[in-house]
């Protein structure tokens, strides 16, 4: 028997469910009474689904994940795992043996949107050209961590003095604070990008300083 | 040929500590967990500790947890096996085997003996 | 005390078919496939079924093994006297996350 899975990793949305495809080619006259089925998490070996004897077993993990059983006389062992979690990451093997046996891992990405950045400025009034000023960019409960970039009204790239933190929440997603330290000239535009370097998706906040007032 | 040679077996008195070594050969090494099992003298097959392939995840019977520590060297292809605070139950003979994708331990060393005795 | 239970002894005459029984839990043998494990005296284990019934290449086809809802079984036919030797029964536990051993049969041929 040969099990085929998708070799890209699978992206999955924070409270989302997704699918790990699984899939192997049943002989002729195969009945589901032959067929063993363990879905494992490759790291550690924890079972997360069996299915075994003609019996789904039912999930060892959470009680979030399914099979489709309609579909596994057809060949198709794929794993359901409901409302995922940032701690549900990493590599999950798929295992069937019927006659003989085989086996193949597929990787399960999770992935959440970073919320629009929110912009503070301090201070924030009796602002002059030549005074420092720190601008705070904070965007919110996205997964993985970002990537934070700063740029100035000409679209140049603001690098030096930029402290950016990242702190995980109970839930395992990142709240970012990037913080631009910057000498005002008499107007300017300032841009923080957050980048979620798995969905691609760019927020974007600014704030404009054209003496008084702010803009954000 | 695949083989697995283990070594560093010897007479410790009670209290005392010993580190055994399995020497690996004849396959990838750093892509399989590996276990340690052992065999006291009439007595049947007894599970130790297991290892993923990485070293990061570890794996105790009860038996052993929190006086032996698996470890292992990729770059030098062996496993370890740190015994310390060792009692007269712990003599026997260990065994180093792999681990593979299917849940199978199908190589298995030779053995070491270690005799706990006053 | 094993968490596996295999009976501690088996006879049989040169040609006769014993079985061996390793009885388990929905933890072990319910969920994950069985090994059975061959030990001549004085020597390290060797690989006799693997995966509840295959056979690695060397092993004769005199050994088969299945597996029903909690218990394996190994069935050795055509008994022959270099069949004596002490089996066992291994698979890993979920609960206790360990590899687990049966006690261990005794095949003596008479």
């Known amino acids: 028997v040969e099990v085929q899975v998708s070799e890209d990793p699978v992206v999955a949305l924070v409270d989302t469910d997704a699918t790990l495809r699984c899939s192997f080619s049943p002989e002729p006259g195969f009945s589901l009474a032959q067929l063993n089925l363990i879905w494992q998490l490759t790291d550690t070996k924890q079972l997360v689904h069996s299915f075994t004897e003609g019996r789904d077993q039912g999930s060892a993990y959470s009680n979030r994940t399914a099979l489709f059983p309609d579909l596994l006389v057809q060949g198709n062992a794929s794993l359901r795992l409901q409302r995922v979690r940032v701690t549900d990451e990493g590599s999950y093997t798929c295992f069937v043996s019927i006659q003989d046996f085989d086996s193949a891992a597929v990787s399960l990405q999770v992935a959440a949107p970073y919320s629009k950045p929110s912009m503070t400025l301090e201070p924030n009034k009796d602002l002059r050209p030549g005074n420092m000023v720190t601008i705070t960019c904070s965007s919110y409960q996205g997964y993985p961590e970002a990537e934070v970039f700063w740029k100035d009204g000409q679209g140049v790239p603001l690098t030096g003095n930029v402290t950016t933190s990242q702190m995980a929440n109970e839930r395992g997603l990142f709240d970012v604070h990037s913080v631009l330290r910057v000498v005002l000239g008499a107007n300017g535009t300032y841009s923080c990008l957050v980048r979620n370097p798995v969905l691609q998706q760019d927020a974007h906040g600014s704030v404009t300083i054209t003496g008084q007032p702010l803009t954000f | 040929e695949v083989q697995l040679l283990e070594s560093g077996g010897d007479l410790v008195q009670p209290g005392g500590s010993l580190r055994l070594s399995c020497a690996a050969s004849g396959f990838t090494f750093n892509t399989y967990w590996m276990n340690w099992v052992r065999q006291a003298p009439g007595k049947g097959l007894e599970w130790v500790a297991g290892i993923n392939s990485k070293g990061g995840v570890t794996y105790y019977a009860d038996s052993v947890k929190g006086r032996f520590t698996i470890s292992r060297d990729n770059s030098k292809n062996t496993l370890y096996l740190q015994m310390n605070s060792l009692r007269a139950e712990d003599t026997a003979v260990y065994y180093c085997?792999?681990?593979?994708?299917?849940?199978?331990?199908?190589?298995w060393g030779q053995g070491t003996t270690v005799t706990v005795s006053s | 005390q094993s968490v596996l239970t295999q009976p501690p002894s088996a006879s049989g005459t040169p040609g006769q078919t014993i079985t061996i029984s390793c009885s388990g839990s929905?933890?072990?043998?319910?969920?994950?496939?069985v090994n059975w494990y061959q030990q001549l005296p004085g020597t390290a284990p060797k690989l006799l079924i693997y995966?509840?019934?295959q056979r690695p290449s060397g092993v004769p086809d005199r050994f088969s093994g299945s597996k029903s809802g909690t218990s394996a079984s190994l069935a050795i036919s055509g008994l022959q006297s270099e069949d004596e030797a002490d089996y066992y029964c291994a698979t890993w536990d979920d609960s206790l996350n360990a590899w687990v051993f049966g006690g261990g049969t005794k095949l003596t041929v008479l």
């Open positions: 995966t509840n019934a």
């Open positions: 085997a792999d681990w593979n994708d299917y849940d199978i331990m199908d190589v």
């Open positions: 929905s933890s072990n043998v319910g969920r994950r496939t």
